[in-house]
């Protein structure tokens, strides 16, 4: 029978006669930076080329016994998970191995850097098809390792890494914390985060998605036909490297941003039991388990978006947090969130020729997060329209006035410490759909975009008094681009997008009583691209 | 023993190739920064990645490495250039005493220096 992990990544709509990947990743080369490997293992024989690259530290311990099977254990298993004949994800992918970890599984940042440089030079000397680099290793946060990963990613290489097995925030480790790298956490057969004794999978905003990483059957270096089960975020990352190889083989022109968005889009949503994560990390950790797309040509027509959380601003009064999209993604909206509820909103602003999302802490606040909605929108022309606080009138409004521009997101930012003491209007004037409306003491920012065939609509869901959270979702075929709260008073903790649902969190004031003025509305902006849909139909 | 001889050879070369006209002052602009792993047990003091500014050419990287060796030698310190980076990041990997960090941070073209550290299979 099919191992649980391969079954898990196979799409739910899978039928043997329908989903037959033509080549299983044959156009893609996967580089593995790990221990030495047993290249003559039947699972990977002829599929893995061992390069002459080796940069490893000496083993610890005075009486260490170097045994080939132990030296090769980790790398052999991972090569098998990526492309093994029987138990591999991308059975057609070819691999190249670089030895950066010693027999004890230990390496150095410098050795890894030299390995990444070796890959870049190989790519320049002999350009091949799409490249995937698997980094099933982790160390403490390293500026230089993250920088090298960024450079390699910008050279068109897809990097996939283990989130780390420290039951900790992945942002404290490298290369897991590098934004350009696809960082993978581990889940088990019950879709629970993997526990490894006291430790376990890392979590947090630096994780892109999870994948199977417990009791994974793969090639064992004990003999050329042996199999063994291993666990860890390395195994999870190997699954995603295999899925990436399949996707790139089917669509070799995919950029890193497109690949990441597809991986997120085709993942199983909301299946992980979040109670395992520390409470303050649950909202930041993606509830996504990687899966193969239901067909090899898919989804070109869809408007893809993902949510990017910033680092925490810290508690100082003027502290801010910035969330950024990848270079070839568009920032379509910006929101903010504070656990204490003390924040001064958020705004979209230009930085280095690109829009970023900045959230502002308030006096007495424990800090804020900025939340960017980052989307793939070819040929887009987006701008931010701002209206200063209206002060005397019913509320501040701003709309997209340029011809052909549609509203994709609303943000509001205020200088007063507590909007709650400045009561918003009871009645919210309803204007055109291309309009953002907010508190009269706040400046309002509208994200307005022009892109071929882009259409958007506003969806709202309000409840009379705050009860923890209000949600509103976009329907099938539409993608959530903007998520904000009305009226934005002090009991609103913030708004953020989870997949295609806009979540507005507020303090539960049901115990203290409420008035109609304390009603909270979640406002979602849902968009789709007729142009992308037509282009996709023309291809078929 | 071989390692020590290698170090000695490099030291002599560094002294020979010293360029008289080289000033020791850093370039104008921002000061280079030093980074190290937050987890002490994973630190590998004595080996450092010197990262140079983005547009630095390979020849400048090599020259900066030589200059560090020369200035270190003048202070009686042995250094060993383990690798010169180019292709991804400009810079070099150097084995040296932590006492030389202040000196290295003042070299021209230096963006930041990071102490080497361990990574582990996951």
């Amino acid at each position: 029978s099919i191992p649980w992990n391969l079954e898990r990544i196979t799409p739910p709509r899978y039928r043997a006669d329908e989903y037959q990947p033509p080549d299983g990743g044959s156009l893609v080369e996967v580089y593995l930076l790990d221990t030495s490997i047993q290249s003559d293992h039947r699972e990977i024989e002829g599929r893995v080329m061992v390069t002459d690259f080796e940069n490893v530290p000496e083993e610890d311990g005075t009486r260490f016994h170097r045994q080939a099977s132990k030296c090769d254990s980790h790398g052999t298993h991972l090569a098998g998970v990526v492309s093994g004949r029987d138990a591999g994800v991308a059975k057609g992918a070819s691999m190249r191995s670089l030895r950066v970890l010693n027999c004890q599984g230990k390496g150095t940042v410098s050795g890894t850097l030299i390995g990444l440089e070796f890959i870049r030079k190989s790519q320049l000397v002999q350009p091949v098809g799409p490249l995937v680099v698997l980094l099933p290793l982790a160390g403490g946060y390293s500026r230089v390792l993250n920088a090298a990963c960024q450079r390699l990613a910008r050279a068109g290489v897809v990097l996939v890494t283990a989130a780390g097995n420290f039951r900790d925030d992945a942002c404290l480790y490298s290369p897991a914390s590098a934004p350009e790298v696809i960082t993978v956490g581990a889940t088990n057969a019950q879709d629970q985060p993997v526990t490894l004794g006291t430790l376990g999978t890392n979590f947090g905003r630096c994780v892109d998605l999870f994948a199977p990483g417990e009791d994974i059957i793969g090639a064992s270096s004990d003999c050329s036909t042996c199999f063994v089960s291993q666990s860890g975020t390395s195994q999870a990352a190997a699954h995603v490297a295999g899925i990436a190889a399949m996707m790139l083989s089917a669509e070799p022109e995919l950029t890193l941003a497109e690949l990441r968005q597809r991986l997120i889009h085709f993942s199983a949503k909301d299946v992980i039991n979040e109670a395992w994560f520390p409470e303050d990390q649950r909202v930041l950790t993606p509830n996504l388990v990687a899966a193969l797309p239901p067909s090899t040509h898919g989804a070109g027509w869809q408007l893809f978006c993902r949510t990017v959380w910033s680092a925490h601003s810290g508690p100082t009064r003027m502290a801010t947090a910035i969330a950024r999209c990848a270079p070839d993604e568009e920032l379509l909206s910006c929101s903010s969130f504070s656990r204490s509820g003390k924040r001064r909103g958020e705004r979209m602003e230009a930085q280095g020729g690109k829009l970023v999302c900045r959230a502002h802490n308030a006096f007495g606040g424990e800090g804020v997060y900025a939340i960017a909605r980052c989307c793939l929108l070819p040929q887009a022309n987006c701008s931010v329209h701002t209206a200063p606080p209206a002060e005397a009138s019913m509320g501040t409004r701003v709309h997209c006035h340029q011809q052909g521009h549609v509203l994709t997101g609303c943000s509001s930012h205020w200088e007063v410490e507590d909007l709650g003491t400045h009561k918003p209007p009871v009645l919210r004037p309803r204007g055109q759909p291309n309009q953002c409306v907010g508190h009269r003491e706040a400046s309002i920012h509208a994200s307005c975009c022009h892109a071929p065939g882009l259409e958007c609509k506003v969806k709202e869901h309000g409840i009379p008094a705050p009860q923890g959270q209000v949600t509103v979702a976009c329907e099938e075929g539409w993608t959530l681009t903007g998520c904000s709260a009305l009226p934005g008073t002090s009991h609103v903790l913030g708004a953020y997008a989870v997949d295609n649902t806009c979540v507005v969190r507020s303090r539960d004031v049901s115990t203290t009583g409420s008035t109609s003025e304390e009603a909270v509305t979640a406002v979602a902006i849902c968009c789709r691209s007729r142009h992308l849909a037509q282009a996709s139909q023309e291809l078929q | 023993q071989e390692d020590e001889d290698g170090d000695y050879e490099e030291l002599v070369l560094a002294l020979r190739s010293e360029e008289d006209g080289l000033a020791e002052a850093p370039e104008h602009g921002t000061t280079a920064t030093f980074h190290r792993c937050a987890k002490d047990p994973w630190r590998l003091p004595g080996t450092y990645v010197v990262v140079l500014k983005e547009e630095t050419h390979l020849s400048q990287s090599e020259r900066t490495a030589r200059r560090l060796q020369a200035q270190a030698a003048r202070r009686g310190y042995l250094t060993k250039i383990l690798h010169v980076f180019h292709g991804l990041l400009p810079g070099f990997l150097v084995k040296m005493s932590g006492d030389l960090l202040e000196l290295a941070l003042k070299l021209p073209h230096v963006d930041y220096i990071e102490e080497d550290s361990s990574v582990f299979a996951q």
Partner: antibody
Amino acid sequence: QVQLVESGGGVVQPGRSLRLSCAASGFTFSSFGMHWVRQAPGKGLEWVALIWNDGSNKYYADSVKGRFTISRDNSKNTLYLQMNSLRAEDTAVYYCARAIAALYYYYGMDVWGQGTTVTVSS
Amino acid sequence: QSVLTQPPSVSAAPGQKVTISCSGSSSNIGNNFVSWYQQLPGTAPKLLIYDYNKRPSGIPDRFSGSKSGTSATLGITGLQTGDEADYYCGTWDSSLSGYVFGTGTRVTVL
């Protein structure tokens, strides 16, 4: 559930030998380093030995070096401590304990057995 | 003779806070991860803190750890009678190539 059960303790004369066993259950034994720790009556904890998850590395306290041998059988999920040339000062409760992780053996111990008593007396 | 020094005893009233220090050197606390263990009377030790300040699941946040230079500290807030026990710090010692425990501290709830 995760469990460690020590056995093999008893009363033994000085100079004689004893072999302690520790049966592990409820976790993947081969993925974790294992320690032996002892506690003399009314005294504090004293670390005795550590073996890596795959048996490739062994470490001993100076007080037992050359006399005690730590080993493991991953197929039987069992840890052993062979104690030779026993002395009166080896009298203690001996605990086996699981290392928090395989590779980061210096992280400490997260699961402990209930202990087995060794008395060395003539 | 332990290379990690702890005070022999500390005491406080219920609900109060106590701190236990653990002093070492650069070869142990200075450059290695510190763990803290609780040993209730007549039982095996139990892990309270690892990696200086991380708590295993099930350990209440009344227990906290910190490190500064070559010393580590365990803090216990909201002291309860059930906290009466011996507490040990522990870390790897790179020069000894072995694990070392502190001398142990008895906590008494008055």
